[in-house]
Structures are given as structure tokens and as C-alpha cells.
């Protein structure tokens, strides 16, 4: 049994880190493999993660961590029974992938504006709460070429767009993702998308 692609890990900078890797052949990850992780300092407790399959040869493990802080560094040992397949280390604060924003809502009650709001995925006591910026993807359900990205570089999780910039009588979808500038993170996953119907009509005199 052999590792084809070594584990790479990302952290939500709160309590969960996710490691993914690929094996040399089809593997029942949960039955055959264990990922052990330990905080690098004195004789910290060793924790065990049971991986799940992620495609035929892929494995993924969700490591639960006790309140990730900037000083934390972990050793990682990938075992197949008594055989050590791979050994590495992981510093969560240097490999941050933010949690995805949630509760994306579209407000169309103001006639000429579409207001999108969503929730910051972090509590205010987490440094990332005030460090996130967002990208909002809006697309036409009937024409995937009619897609746009709005970068939201201010802190408030809202976006206002003129309804007139969207085609009338068309259903649109939106989704949002986040990244943190000070930590030079990767982008989060996209939020679940939300759908709305653009019923905006130009005023009569502009037709």
C-alpha cells in the first residue's frame, strides 16, 4: 500500500482542519487507514482521524482541533495498520481556507435594486470575522454565459446591484464565497446558491 499524492491540509482557523490525499490504488480509506495528529509541544495528546473515501483512490480526513491558535503546529502520521505510509507537519494558521458564508438571501422588494445579504461564517471573537472579503457570483439560469462576479471588499456582508443591470423576466442565481486578506488564504467553498426572478421593468418613458 502506497501514497500516490501526499496529504495536503487546510484549516478553517477555528476547530476543523481537512486533509486530502490519493492512494496508489483503490482503497477503503475508513477501514484501512488512520491519520494520527499531535500538537508539536512537549508530550501533547495524540488524536486519531478516521478518513473517508473521496473518489476511488482519494481519501479525506476532518481533523477536530481544540481551538486553533496561531502558535499551533501539528505532526501528521498516516498509518495503514502497523505500516507508517507518510509523515509530515501542518501549521493551521499558514494554510487557512475560510468557512463558506451562509444564509444568502435576495431582497427584491425595493423596485430598482437587488439587495443580497449573507452571514459572516465566523463569530466576532475570531480574527477572521473582520478580515473577510467576498466574491458574489450571479448568473442567468437560462444562459450560463450571462455570469458575473462582484468583489465585495468592504466588511459588511451585503451587495446592492441595480435591477436594470439584469435582464428582465429572467431567473437568476447567486452564490458567495470568502477569503481573508491578512492570512492570504485560499477562497472558501461557494455558499449554497439562491434563486430569484428579476421582474424589474424599465420606467415607461425609458422604453
Amino acid at each position: 500500500m502506497k501514497v500516490l499524492q501526499e496529504p495536503t491540509c487546510v484549516s478553517d482557523y477555528m476547530s476543523i482542519s481537512t486533509c486530502e490525499w490519493k492512494m496508489g490504488g483503490p482503497t477503503n480509506c475508513s477501514a484501512e487507514l488512520r491519520l494520527l495528529y499531535q500538537l508539536v509541544f512537549q508530550s501533547s495528546e495524540t488524536h486519531t482521524c478516521v478518513p473517508e473515501n473521496n473518489g476511488g483512490v482519494g481519501c479525506v480526513c476532518h481533523l477536530l482541533m481544540d481551538d486553533v491558535v496561531s502558535m499551533d503546529n501539528y505532526t501528521l502520521d498516516l498509518w495503514a495498520g502497523q505500516q507508517l505510509l507518510w509523515k509530515g507537519s501542518f501549521k493551521p494558521s499558514e494554510h487557512v481556507k475560510p468557512r463558506a458564508p451562509g444564509n444568502l438571501t435576495v431582497h427584491t422588494n425595493v423596485s430598482d435594486t437587488v439587495l443580497l445579504t449573507w452571514s459572516n461564517p465566523y463569530p466576532p471573537d475570531n480574527y477572521l470575522y473582520n478580515d473577510l472579503t467576498y466574491a458574489v457570483n450571479i448568473w442567468n439560469e437560462n444562459d450560463l454565459a450571462d455570469s458575473r462576479i462582484h468583489n465585495v471588499t468592504y466588511l459588511k456582508p451585503t451587495l446592492r446591484i441595480p435591477a436594470s443591470t439584469l435582464k428582465s423576466g429572467i431567473s437568476y442565481r447567486a452564490r458567495v464565497r470568502a477569503w481573508a486578506q491578512h492570512y492570504n488564504t485560499t477562497w472558501s467553498e461557494w455558499s449554497p446558491s439562491t434563486k430569484w426572478y428579476n421582474s424589474y421593468r424599465e420606467p415607461f418613458e425609458q422604453r
Epitope: 481551538d67 491558535v69 496561531s70 502558535m71 499551533d72 503546529n73 471573537d125 480574527y127 491578512h182
Partner: antibody
Framework: QVQLQESGGGLVQPGGSLRLSCAAS????????LTWVRQAPGKGLEWVST????????LYADSVKDRFTISRDNAKNTLYLQMNSLKPEDTAVYYC??????????????WGQGTTVTVSS | DIQMTQSPSSLSASLGDRVTITCQAS??????LAWYQQKSGQAPKLLIY???RLQTGVPSRFSGSGSGTSFTLTISGLETEDLATYYC?????????FGQGTKLEIK
Amino acid sequence: QVQLQESGGGLVQPGGSLRLSCAASGFTFSSYSLTWVRQAPGKGLEWVSTIKARGGTTLYADSVKDRFTISRDNAKNTLYLQMNSLKPEDTAVYYCAKPLYSNLAGDFGSWGQGTTVTVSS
Amino acid sequence: DIQMTQSPSSLSASLGDRVTITCQASQSISSYLAWYQQKSGQAPKLLIYGGSRLQTGVPSRFSGSGSGTSFTLTISGLETEDLATYYCLQVYSWPLTFGQGTKLEIK
């Protein structure tokens, strides 16, 4: 506003024990890692111990490991430091400190006023 | 353990002077560095975190710079109330380690 109030310091003989407390208010106590830092007379600052928010992880300086125990009671909003087998070199002002953010555990935005521990025969 | 070496250990400067204190780490700590001010008989006070981010309420004459192994705390125009000892602290890895301190006196 955040308040941290240490107590429990005093004069103790070498080999003796003390239990320091730090009563906290003004923030969600259970969300933050908390730390003890000490300062010997006329000397610099020294990290002593940190306990993570949920209490499952405790970390110690080599100079106090196996003698000191950090703990917390999230219901009482109180941090503790049980100090056993005390040595003269443990003589210091002991501060409890709270970080600015829950995941920046060393950027201490709030400090108590300190409690003095003197180890002498 | 990461060693933090501060220099100078003490310095004397005049009001209005630009004052620079440096902190050298024994290995790279990225930008995981904080600066503290401690006045006589008081608890320390956070000035700078993340190497360069000014803590709320700290006068703008204080600034921090550097990354990797070399860091600087600058006071752009010294004032009487800045009489204190200044400490750097690395928050990159356990154990947390402070610099030995720089005692700032007013000429």
C-alpha cells in the same frame, strides 16, 4: 469592558503550594484561550502557561511543567493556576492575560493587575 | 524554542526624537510578533500585533514593521508618557517567548 482580577498570591516556603485565581468579566469567557505570564523582580516577562478555550489543551513553560497546573471553570468565568513544589525562582508577579481574538492566543489585549508570589524561607 | 533578541537593552532619547527598537528572532516567525509597553508598577499593554497592526487606542506615533526574523518598533515623536520598558513577543510557535526588554528613558 474586559476585566481580569488575579488573587491568591502571598508568601510561601520553598516546596509549598499556592493556588492563583483570575476572575474574568466583560467578555465571553468560554471562547478564549487564557494565559499566565510572570515577571520576577527587576526582570522581564516570561510566559508560564496557556489553556485553550474548551480546556482540553494545556501548555506549560519547561520551567514549571509537572509542578504547575492551569485550569478553568467556564461556568464561574475563572482561570486558575495551581502551583506546587514552589522554588525561590518562582518569586514573581503573576498576570493573567486574554488575547484580542480567540485565535490569536498570544496577542494579549487585556491583562490583570497582577498578584505577587514570594517563595522564601 | 525560538529566541527573541531585543536591542538595545536600554536607551535614552529626547522628547520629539524618533526612537527605534529592534527584535531579532532565531528563526523565521513570519509576521507573528507583538510589541508591549510596560510602565513601572503596571501591567503590560499591547501596542502592535501581527508585526505591524496598531492596537485600538494606541497613538499613531507607534508603528511596527518587519517580517521573517527582523522586526522594528518605531516611536516617531517621543513623548513623556512613553517612558517605559518595551517587549517583543513571538506568537509563531509554542512556547511563547519574549524579548528581554528595552528600557526607554527620557533625556
